[in-house]
Interface confidence: medium
């Protein structure tokens, strides 16, 4: 979690002198409670916005907006603490609005916004706005919280943000998977414009079950520049295991901008429909011709049980 770096953070508006400060998320009013505290925020709204840094990078940000209740407690409102908690890591970042002048009622409801918390694709956050000072231990709460889910990089606007582009969001491999026979799958996909290797993970499952019965990993070496944006095809050899008929193919690129953390794309082949009168199948079909003197195991992850081509 971080703040967008692009300009001095502003919270002043007509009728209010205000400054934005870093916060430890532990306001002084927790330690030294006050007798009179303001009421809670009203109508807290969190939206996904996009903002550019000074360097021109585009980032998703949480746009936080709330209004004040129209009661006399605004006379005791000294500011607000904005807290963003990333739910999967428990990481928290806070800022504090510090009011340098007293608030007065005016003909419009007071409204505040803040759009400088940078958020990550496909993450969920809890956004809390605390009015300051915070209430005494048994006092009524004066905060409002909302959860906020950031879309992943498949989302049209997210796709062109810097974090998504860095993880390979602009690459559309357009995967097709075709069952050639009971023992072979053909995978076709479009290469990206970078000399980097790819990894294909084949995971097979029994019909209607979620524990895998077979895994095979295949390495595709970095294509040459003339092969960029071309289709590549790989033939994967399947293990002839009972009922292991649903196949998921996942392609992992290793682009320089994201290394091991690039977006992965996958496609699935369902189990074939069972015919009314099953055809007899041969008891055993060899998976490969053993190479003379070869002692390589060819099961879950051997390179030897697949081959690939790039073609224009």
């Amino acid at each position: 979690l971080r703040l967008l770096d692009h300009r001095a953070l502003v919270c002043s508006q007509p009728g209010l002198n205000c400054t934005v400060k870093n916060s430890t998320c532990l306001d002084d009013s927790w330690i030294h409670p006050r007798n009179l505290t303001p009421s809670s925020p009203k109508d807290l709204q969190i939206q996904l916005h996009f903002a550019h840094t000074q360097q021109g990078d585009l980032f998703p940000v949480a746009h936080i907006e709330w209004t004040l209740q129209t009661d006399a407690s605004i006379l005791y409102l000294e500011g607000a603490e904005l807290s963003v908690l990333q739910l999967n890591t428990n990481e928290r970042l806070c800022v504090r609005f510090e009011f340098l002048s007293k608030l007065r009622h005016h003909h419009r409801r007071w409204r505040f916004t803040f759009s400088h918390f940078v958020v990550d694709p496909d993450q969920e956050y809890e956004v809390t706005v605390h009015h300051l000072p915070k209430p005494i231990p048994d006092g009524d709460p004066n905060h409002q919280s909302k959860n906020f889910l950031v879309p992943d990089c498949e989302h049209a606007r997210m796709k062109v943000t810097t974090p998504c582009m860095s993880s390979g969001s602009l690459w559309d491999p357009n995967i097709t998977v075709e069952t050639l026979d009971t023992q072979h799958l053909r995978v076709d996909f479009t290469l990206w414009n970078e000399s980097t290797h790819y990894q294909i993970l084949l995971t097979s499952f029994p019909h209607m079950e979620n524990h895998s019965c077979f895994e095979h990993m295949h390495h595709i070496p970095a294509p040459r520049p003339e092969e960029f944006h071309q289709r590549s095809n790989v033939t994967l050899t399947l293990r002839n295991l009972k009922g292991c008929c649903r196949h998921q193919v996942q392609i992992q690129p290793f682009f320089s901008s994201c290394l091991n953390d690039c977006l992965r794309h996958s496609a699935t082949v369902s189990c074939p429909e069972m015919p009314d009168t099953p055809e007899p199948i041969p008891d055993y079909m060899p998976l490969w011709e053993p190479r003379s003197g070869s002692s390589d195991y060819k099961d879950d992850d051997d390179k030897g049980s697949s081959h690939h081509h790039h073609h224009h």
Partner: antibody
Framework: QVQLVQSGAEVKKPGASVKVSCKAS????????ISWVRQAPGQGLEWMGW????????NYAQKLQGRVTMTTDTSTSTAYMELRSLRSDDTAVYYC?????????WGQGTLVTVSS | EIVMTQSPATLSVSPGERVTLSCRAS??????LAWFQQKPGQAPRPLIY???TRAAGIPARFSGSGSGTDFTLTISSLQSEDFAVYYC?????????FGGGTKVEIK
């Protein structure tokens, strides 16, 4: 060369848990799954389950489902097998082995004794 | 689950003899079968996979055959270091299962 080095012997009381580690070296850890096999004293081999070091997918023996958890730490190339609610008939040598279907390299084994 | 049955349970033989160990599956396992050798206090050692392919570093005196339900491990001329317990294992279907083992002892 490929090596799987397991943690040392353990003595546990019934109802307790044990966590056995298996540190792999000499190959790319995420390219191969790790299977776990146990052998009670004087008995044969029993397959316990498997974990993919790449995807984290697991497949456990039905009789151990709910009591066993297999995990990996790719940063240290280590696989772990935790068995909970131990009983006296869990006393065995526990082996980790490389691969999913058949096993080309084995750890040296970890003796787990369950006794009150 | 597929039950693997090995016979005999114990075999007493002299060095130099030809040894044939049998493994039977309760249903077809195609050729998805492996053989292991285990000596006291040691981890199993892979000998054969895919019913007939020797694992790395395994001497030519060990050979495997069979498919479907009946499999054989043959040691053409038994050496002193071959006295051990031998296990078969199927990997055609989950759960993976082992045979009960055949102990090859000195006559």
């Amino acid at each position: 060369q490929v090596q799987l080095v397991q943690s040392g012997a353990e003595v546990k009381k019934p109802g307790a848990s044990v966590k056995v580690s298996c540190k792999a070296s000499g190959y790319t850890f995420t390219r191969y799954g790790i299977s776990w096999v146990r052998q009670a004293p004087g008995q044969g081999l029993e397959w316990m389950g498997w974990i993919s070091a790449y995807s984290g997918n697991t497949n456990y023996a039905q009789k151990l489902q709910g009591r066993v958890t297999m995990t990996t730490d790719t940063s240290t190339s280590t696989a772990y097998m935790e068995l909970r609610s131990l009983r006296s008939d869990d006393t065995a040598v526990y082996y980790c082995a490389r691969r999913q279907l058949y096993f080309d390299y084995w750890g040296q084994g970890t003796l787990v004794t369950v006794s009150s | 689950e597929i039950v693997m049955t090995q016979s005999p349970a114990t075999l007493s033989v002299s060095p130099g003899e030809r040894v044939t160990l049998s493994c039977r599956a309760s249903q077809s396992v195609s050729s998805n079968l492996a053989w292991f050798q285990q000596k006291p206090g040691q981890a199993p050692r892979p000998l054969i996979y895919d019913a007939s392919t020797r694992a790395a570093g395994i001497p030519a005196r060990f050979s495997g055959s069979g498919s479907g339900t009946d499999f054989t491990l043959t040691i053409s001329s038994l050496q002193s270091e071959d006295f051990a317990v031998y296990y078969c294992q199927q990997y055609d279907n989950w759960p993976l299962t082992f045979g009960g083992g055949t102990k090859v002892e000195i006559k």
